[in-house]
C-alpha cells in the first residue's frame, strides 16, 4: 500500500513539476524590468525566452518573437535547449509511469517489468527537474550578470544635462514557477526510485537465485529479515500467475536487475 | 463612434469644490483609462491624472494630488472629476480624453470651463 | 518629472512653405524594449480640444494628412509641416508619453505670414 502510494504521489508531483516546466517554458515574464530606478515608467518591458513584450500603461501589450537564431546570445540557446530537454524527458518519464503504477493493470505485467518502468520514469523526471533548474538557474546568472554590467553603465557618462535612463532587468515569474516546477519534478522523481525499491517483490531483498540440492527436493534458503520472522513458510519454488499481483511473501525465483541481495 | 461629451461651465467660489462629468459612447468605457488635463487660460496643458473603470485604479499628478478626486460610473459609462479646496489658480479649462496605444490621448471632450471668483 | 521644451514658441510661415517645430526632453523617452520614442504631437486650434496627430514619435494617427511628419529620436524630436495650410493655424504641443507625470511641451504657435 505504501509502495502503491508513494508511486502514486511521485507520479502526480512529476505531473504537476513538469506542467510547471513547460508553462515556465511557454511564459514571456523570464526577465521584467527593473523598476527601482523608475517606478513611475509608463512603459513596463519583459522577456521571455521566445520573444520580448513592451506593455503600456494604456493597456495596450506588443510582443515580438525572436525570428532570428543565429543572432540570439548563446545563454538564451543553451537555456532553451535544456527546457526543452527537460519537456521532453518529463513528458516521455510520464508516459513511462503511466503503465508503471502498480494501480493500473496492463495484461500479466511482472512486477519486475513495472519496477524497471518506474525506476527509467523516475531517472527521466530527476533529469529532466535538472535540466529545468540548471536551465533557470543559467537565466537567473545571465540575469544577475547584466544588471550590474547595466548599473556600472548607468552611472558613467552622466556628466550632461540630459540624463538617459538605461533599462535594467530583474527575475520575471517565470524562473521562481521553473525553480517550483524543477524542484517538484525531481521530487517527484526520487518518489519514484524509491517506490521502486518496493515495487520488487519483498523476497529479492535477500534471494537472488534459489539453490537446489542434488536428490533432495528442499530449497536452500539464506537467512536474512524475512527468514527471522517465522514467515518463511513458502519454501517450495512456487511461482503464482495472477497478473502480476502477488503477495508479499510469494518467491520470485527469477533473477532480476533490482534483486538486492 | 466615440464621443466624449463633458458637463457644462462652472462659476465656484474659493474653497469650494467642483464636480466634473465626462459622457463615454462608442467604445467599451470599462477597458480604457479616463485622462483629465488642465489648460488655464492663454496656457498650456497639465496632466492632472488618470482613471481605469474597470477596478477604480487611478494614478495623480503630484501638483494635484490631495485635492483631486477621479471616479468612474461604469453603469453610466462616466467618469468625474472632482477639485476640492478651490483657489483662483484653479480656473482653467478641464479635459477629458482617452487613453490609447502609445500612451496618447486620442479622443477628448470638448472642455469644462471652470471659473473660481469671489 | 520630465521637462519638455518646445521651439520656438511661435513660428510664422507662408503658404505652401515648410514649418519645423522642436521639442527636446530632459530625459531619453527612447523605449529599449521595442526600440520606440513615448513622444506624442497634439494640434490645438482655437476653442477646440487638442487632436492627435503623431504618436510613437513618428506614427500618424488615422485621418492626419501626410503633410504632417515626426522625426527624432532619445530626446530631440521634430515635428514637420511640408506644406503648410490654412487650416494647419494652430498651437502645436508635444507630450511626454514615457514616464509619470505625463508632461507636456509649453506649445509651439504656428501663424500664417
Known amino acids: 500500500m505504501a509502495v502503491t502510494a508513494c508511486q502514486g504521489l511521485g507520479f502526480v508531483v512529476s505531473l504537476i513539476g513538469i506542467a510547471g516546466i513547460i508553462a515556465a517554458t511557454c511564459m514571456d515574464q523570464w526577465s521584467t524590468q527593473d523598476l527601482y530606478n523608475n517606478p513611475v515608467t509608463a512603459v513596463f518591458n519583459y522577456q521571455g525566452l521566445w520573444r520580448s513584450c513592451v506593455r503600456e500603461s494604456s493597456g495596450f501589450t506588443e510582443c515580438r518573437g525572436y525570428f532570428t537564431l543565429l543572432g540570439l546570445p548563446a545563454m538564451l540557446q543553451a537555456v532553451r535547449a535544456l527546457m526543452i530537454v527537460g519537456i521532453v524527458l518529463g513528458a516521455i518519464g510520464l508516459l513511462v509511469s503511466i503503465f508503471a503504477l502498480k494501480c493500473i493493470r496492463i495484461g500479466s505485467m511482472e512486477d519486475s517489468a513495472k519496477a524497471n518502468m518506474t525506476l527509467t520514469s523516475g531517472i527521466m523526471f530527476i533529469v529532466s527537474g535538472l535540466c529545468a533548474i540548471a536551465g533557470v538557474s543559467v537565466f537567473a546568472n545571465m540575469l544577475v550578470t547584466n544588471f550590474w554590467m547595466s548599473t556600472a553603465n548607468m552611472y558613467t557618462g552622466m556628466g550632461g544635462m540630459v540624463q538617459t535612463v538605461q533599462t535594467r532587468y530583474t527575475f520575471g515569474a517565470a524562473l521562481f514557477v521553473g525553480w517550483v516546477a524543477g524542484g517538484l519534478t525531481l521530487i517527484g522523481g526520487v518518489m519514484m526510485c524509491i517506490a521502486c525499491r518496493g515495487l520488487a517483490p519483498e523476497e529479492t531483498n535477500y534471494k537472488a537465485v534459489s539453490y537446489h540440492a542434488s536428490g533432495h527436493s528442499v530449497a536452500y534458503k539464506p537467512g536474512g529479515f524475512k527468514a527471522s520472522t517465522g514467515f518463511g513458510s513458502n519454501t517450495k519454488n512456487k511461482k503464482i500467475y495472477d497478473g502480476g499481483a502477488r503477495t508479499e511473501d510469494e518467491v520470485q525465483s527469477y533473477p532480476s536487475k533490482h534483486d538486492y541481495v | 463612434q466615440v464621443q466624449l461629451v463633458q458637463s457644462g461651465a462652472e462659476v465656484k467660489k474659493p474653497g469650494a469644490s467642483v464636480k466634473v462629468s465626462c459622457k463615454a459612447s462608442?467604445?467599451?468605457?470599462?477597458?480604457?483609462?479616463m485622462n483629465w488635463v488642465k489648460q488655464a487660460p492663454g496656457q498650456g496643458l497639465e496632466w492632472i491624472g488618470q482613471?481605469?473603470?474597470?477596478?477604480?485604479?487611478?494614478k495623480y499628478n503630484g501638483n494635484f494630488k490631495g485635492r483631486v478626486t477621479l471616479t468612474a460610473d461604469t453603469s453610466a459609462s462616466t467618469a468625474y472629476m472632482e477639485l476640492s479646496s478651490l483657489r483662483s489658480e484653479d480656473t482653467a479649462v478641464y479635459f477629458c480624453?482617452?487613453?490609447?496605444?502609445?500612451?496618447?490621448?486620442?479622443?477628448w471632450g470638448q472642455g469644462t470651463l471652470v471659473t473660481v471668483s469671489s | 518629472d520630465i521637462v519638455m521644451t518646445q521651439s520656438p514658441d511661435s513660428l510664422a510661415v507662408s503658404l505652401g512653405e515648410r514649418a519645423t517645430i522642436n521639442c527636446k526632453s530632459s530625459?531619453?523617452?527612447?523605449?529599449?524594449?521595442?526600440?520606440?520614442?513615448?513622444l506624442t504631437w497634439y494640434q490645438q486650434k482655437p476653442g477646440q480640444p487638442p487632436k492627435l496627430l503623431i504618436y510613437?514619435?513618428?506614427t500618424r494617427d488615422s485621418g492626419v494628412p501626410d503633410r504632417f511628419s515626426g522625426s527624432g529620436s532619445g530626446t530631440d524630436f521634430t515635428l514637420t509641416i511640408s506644406s503648410l495650410q490654412a487650416e494647419d493655424v494652430a498651437v502645436y504641443y508635444c507630450?511626454?508619453?514615457?514616464?509619470?507625470?505625463?508632461?507636456f511641451g509649453g506649445g509651439t504657435k504656428v501663424e500664417i505670414k
Open positions: 507630450q511626454n508619453a514615457y514616464t509619470y507625470p505625463l508632461t
Open positions: 462608442g467604445y467599451a468605457f470599462s477597458n480604457y483609462w
Open positions: 480624453a482617452r487613453y490609447y496605444r502609445g500612451n496618447c490621448f486620442d479622443y
Open positions: 530625459q531619453s523617452l527612447l523605449n529599449s524594449g521595442n526600440q520606440k520614442n513615448y
Open positions: 482613471i481605469y473603470p474597470g477596478n477604480g485604479d487611478t
Open positions: 510613437w514619435a513618428s
